[in-house]
């Protein structure tokens, strides 16, 4: 799996969540969250730069799971990649 | 590859393996999952595990089950108890990249009879 | 729960078939069909509704979104007799088709 990267950007918050995700040599064409204790995928809305977004009524739960499609068809899942707790600014890894 | 005994005692414990080849579960990106079919019927999903331990199973099965993953031996597990002869059946390994199960073992016939 | 339509079905090498799979709400589009032969384990046909997985012939197509999703096959070859099953990936808890056993007329 060629490595990716999860980078929570600045105005992320307890409803809003802004995630700069890079996938080596692809591009994201899709990306979807779900939260911890949920079963349910909800789909990301594609920012500038590569910034994935998501907007929720009620506080978010971390920590937070991905799965994504990407420009070149390549299709993967991290779970629990953002920790409850993240830094803003921060770069996660899927753990290895 | 999946592995295990092809006969197993109603009420007793299923247990079987999955040894991963070609890639390393440790790598990430991927769900591991059990899938089995009754001979005769139709497909049915037990669970996926993630690396890290996290599950996903079936809710009619979720009292019945337990996976797990070794990643140092680059296998995952599923154990089933209190089989029944409805428990017969082929079972399946795959992986699942979120979406889909997009690679498959083989199967092993699992018969539960006295 | 998806149920699938028809459970079985009978035709001719060169025909077209469809396949429909109706989900009780609604799942996007993700759907997946799969093929599965004798004795072998199921292979992976179509992913999200309508993408054709990579080596499967362009004979076979998918398409729908929400809750009615159709699996079609046209110019029907002698090896595509088998079962179909679709799956669905919209939550973590995945389910199944019946399936649809398709046989020789």
């Known amino acids: 799996v060629p490595k990716v990267t999860f980078t929570v950007e600045k105005g992320s918050n307890e409803k809003h969540l802004a995630v700069l995700v890079k996938y080596e040599g692809d591009t994201m064409a899709e990306v979807e969250l779900r939260e911890h204790g949920s079963d349910e995928w909800v789909a990301m809305t594609k920012g500038e730069g590569g910034v994935w977004t998501f907007d929720s009524e009620e506080p978010l739960q971390g920590p937070f799971n991905f799965r994504f499609l990407t420009e070149k068809g390549m299709k993967n899942v991290f779970d629990d990649v953002v920790p409850e707790k993240y830094t803003i600014g921060a770069t996660y890894a899927p753990e290895e | 590859l999946e592995s295990g005994p092809g006969l197993v005692k109603p009420s007793q414990t299923l247990s079987l393996t999955c040894t991963v080849s070609g890639g390393s579960i440790r790598s990430g990106g991927y769900y591991w999952s059990w899938v089995r079919q009754p001979p005769g019927k139709g497909l049915e999903w037990i669970g996926n595990?993630?690396?890290?331990?996290?599950?996903y199973y079936n809710p009619s099965l979720k009292s019945r089950i337990t996976m797990s993953v070794d990643t140092s031996k680059n296998h995952f597990s599923l154990r089933l108890t209190s089989v029944t002869a409805a428990d017969t059946a082929v079972y399946y390994c795959?992986?699942?990249?979120?979406?889909?199960?997009?690679?498959w073992g083989q199967g092993t016939l699992v018969t539960v009879s006295s | 729960e998806l149920t699938q339509s028809p459970s079985s079905l009978s035709a001719s090498v060169g025909d077209r078939v469809t396949i429909t799979c109706r989900a009780r709400?609604?799942?996007?589009?993700?759907l997946n069909w799969y093929q599965q032969k004798p004795g072998k384990a199921p292979k992976l046909l179509i992913w999200s509704a309508s993408n054709l997985q990579s080596g499967v012939p362009s004979r076979f197509s998918g398409s729908g979104s929400g809750t009615e999703f159709t699996l079609t096959i046209s110019n029907l070859q002698f090896e595509d007799f088998a079962s179909y099953y679709c799956q669905q990936s919209y939550t973590t808890l995945y389910t199944f088709g019946s399936g649809t056993k398709l046989e020789i007329k």
């Open positions: 709400q609604s799942i996007s589009t993700y």
């Open positions: 595990i993630y690396h890290s331990g996290n599950t």
């Open positions: 795959a992986r699942s990249d979120g979406y889909t199960l997009d690679n």
